[in-house]
Interface confidence: low
């Protein structure tokens, strides 16, 4: 379409599409506007990656994808005079990014992190088929907090599996479980594929145990009353309380989704403490309690990772087998 | 469609009490936080507070720690902002909103004008 | 405390004109918990960016957000009939005071 074409013409390509990587894992694609585009027309630019997804038309002559690169990924984008999804693009131009080179049976394999106790990450690995006992693994990681890519020290291997942990504590009052932390796994000799892999801060978040501050028994309840682990506020918890009786020997699990300490039993305006009461317990004998807690779906979209189980606090006496 | 919808405007006089209410529908009342934002006539926004119905767990600013309670029933997917005793500074329009973690109010009541005058 | 400083306090332009209005924090914040609103006159403001440059839904996109640390702006890169109104940016706790975007 020349100078003079009507705005509904399809428009010629987007020029100069090019792609680049930031970071270890956001990838960017920016591009020019066509060549010779009608001159009554208000550019807009469809674009969507190679699998057809994540379609988008916007104005902007960019776009950007936190992805892993551990395979290609294509963007294609083309031109077009209106906001009409129904409107027909130009001929879409296509760029693509490969992964770094090398042998796919070298990289490593269920490269995967939590975060614990929204303190530090701990990610782990295992070696890929084809690499040598003795490697040496590097790990890089980057997350919006910190102003560059940054190296785990200290690689660590327990059993088939290789490690690394490093501090990321989470702030308060900011966007900082909004983004991702990016994470590449290769080799000081460069030998091995390099792997990625992006953690969203809104998951694999493991807490540590609550710490059972208190038991009592009131008009035949147990009350349990613990301080939950540091970094976390009682609404995005769950908890499982676990009482064992010597006596009859029972295991009871009770799911606890909602623990206030509203009764006045329970010692009151404690920061980061919560209650909960056990009924039906009998309290001339010994009764053994533990908790544990994981992130609820309120706060953090993975709820899979509880927390170690509490230490144990006993409540009551054991009978004699007499 | 989310909706939040404040009971009618008031005129009390200085020294009593008042409670307001706002509403939410279309969507999981107890996921999200309300705020509570005051404007007095011919000025701007002002953050007040804000209550996770979930739990109850309330915030103030500290300009209005200990001046309003803000406090929340979940069953009927209700929050509520109330004076124990009203004065004539607070009269204000005051509007209730729904409040993502993030921060940012993504939708608003319509507002419920306050008037204190003796 | 943190205080957020908008400017101009009012901003007089025609339609079809370009509008940068400024919010300045007395600290850095983090971007992600920036917004933008409008209000006209007699509504309810309405959410027009948050997390600094994302748009809310059903935002025209003339209206754009960017920013970090302590300065923060917001575009209108050309001004509807209907964009005439105040706006204020806010973090969490603090509202700014508003600029008001009149009709020149």
């Known amino acids: 379409g020349g100078g003079g074409a009507a705005p509904t013409e399809t428009q010629p390509p987007v020029t100069n599409l090019s792609v680049s990587v930031e970071n270890l894992c956001t990838v960017i694609w920016t591009w020019n506007p066509p060549e010779g585009a009608s001159p009554n027309c208000s550019l807009w630019y469809f674009s969507h990656f190679g699998d057809k997804q994540d379609k988008k038309l916007a104005p902007e002559t960019r776009r950007s994808k936190e992805v892993p690169l551990n395979e290609k990924i294509c963007l294609q984008v083309g031109s077009q005079c209106s906001t009409n999804e129904s409107e027909k693009p130009s001929i879409l131009v296509e760029k693509c990014i490969s992964p770094p080179e090398g042998d796919p049976e070298s990289a490593v394999t269920e490269l995967q992190c939590i975060w614990h106790n929204l303190s530090y990450m701990q990610c782990s690995w295992l070696p890929g088929r084809n690499t040598s006992p003795d490697t040496n693994y590097t790990l890089y990681y980057w997350h919006r907090s910190l102003e560059k890519i940054r190296q785990c020290e200290e690689i660590y291997k327990e059993g088939q599996y290789f490690g690394c942990s490093f501090d990321l504590t989470k702030v308060k009052d900011s966007s900082f479980e909004q983004h991702s932390v990016q994470i590449m796994v290769k080799d000081y000799a460069g030998k091995i594929k390099p792997s990625f892999n992006i953690v969203p801060l809104t998951s694999r978040v493991k807490p540590d145990p609550p710490h059972i501050k208190n038991l009592s028994f009131h008009n035949g309840d147990l009350h349990v009353q613990w301080e939950n682990p540091q970094n976390f506020i009682s609404r995005c918890l769950f908890y499982e309380v676990e009482v064992n009786n010597s006596q009859t020997e029972t295991h009871n699990v009770f799911s606890v989704q909602e623990a206030k300490c509203q009764n006045p039993e329970f010692e009151r305006n404690v920061e980061n403490t919560s209650c909960f009461m056990v009924p039906g317990v009998l309290p001339d004998t010994l009764n053994t309690v533990r908790i544990r807690v994981k992130t609820n779906k309120l706060c953090y979209e993975d709820d899979k990772l509880w927390s170690n189980w509490s230490q144990e606090m006993s409540i009551g006496k054991k009978r004699n087998s007499t | 469609e989310v909706q939040l919808v404040q009971s009618g405007a008031e005129v009390k006089k200085p020294g009593e009490s008042l409670k307001i209410s706002c509403k939410g529908s279309g969507y999981s009342f107890t996921s999200y936080w309300i705020g509570w934002v005051r404007q007095m006539p011919g000025k701007g926004l002002e953050w007040m507070g804000v209550i996770y119905p979930g739990d109850s767990y309330t915030r103030y600013s500290p300009s209005f720690q200990g001046q309003v309670t803000i406090s929340a029933d979940k069953s009927i997917s209700t929050a509520y902002l109330q004076w124990s005793s009203l004065k004539a500074s607070d009269t204000a329009m005051y509007y209730c909103?729904?409040?993502?973690?993030?921060?940012?109010?993504?939708?608003w009541g319509q507002g419920t004008l306050v008037t204190v005058s003796s | 405390e943190i205080v957020l400083t908008q400017s101009p306090g009012t901003l007089s332009l025609s339609p079809g004109e370009r509008a940068t209005l400024s919010c300045r924090a007395s600290q850095s914040i983090s971007s992600s918990y920036l917004a933008w609103y409008q209000q006209k006159p007699g509504q309810a403001p309405r959410l027009l960016i948050y997390?600094?440059?994302s748009r809310a839904t059903g935002i025209p996109d003339r209206f754009s957000g960017s920013g970090s640390g302590t300065d923060f702006t917001l575009t209108i890169s050309r001004l509807e009939p209907e964009d005439f109104a105040v706006y204020y940016c806010?973090?969490?706790?603090?509202f700014g005071q508003g600029t008001k975007v009149e009709i020149k």
């Open positions: 997390g600094a440059s």
């Open positions: 909103a729904r409040m993502p973690n993030w921060g940012s109010f993504d939708y």
């Open positions: 806010q973090q969490y706790e603090t």
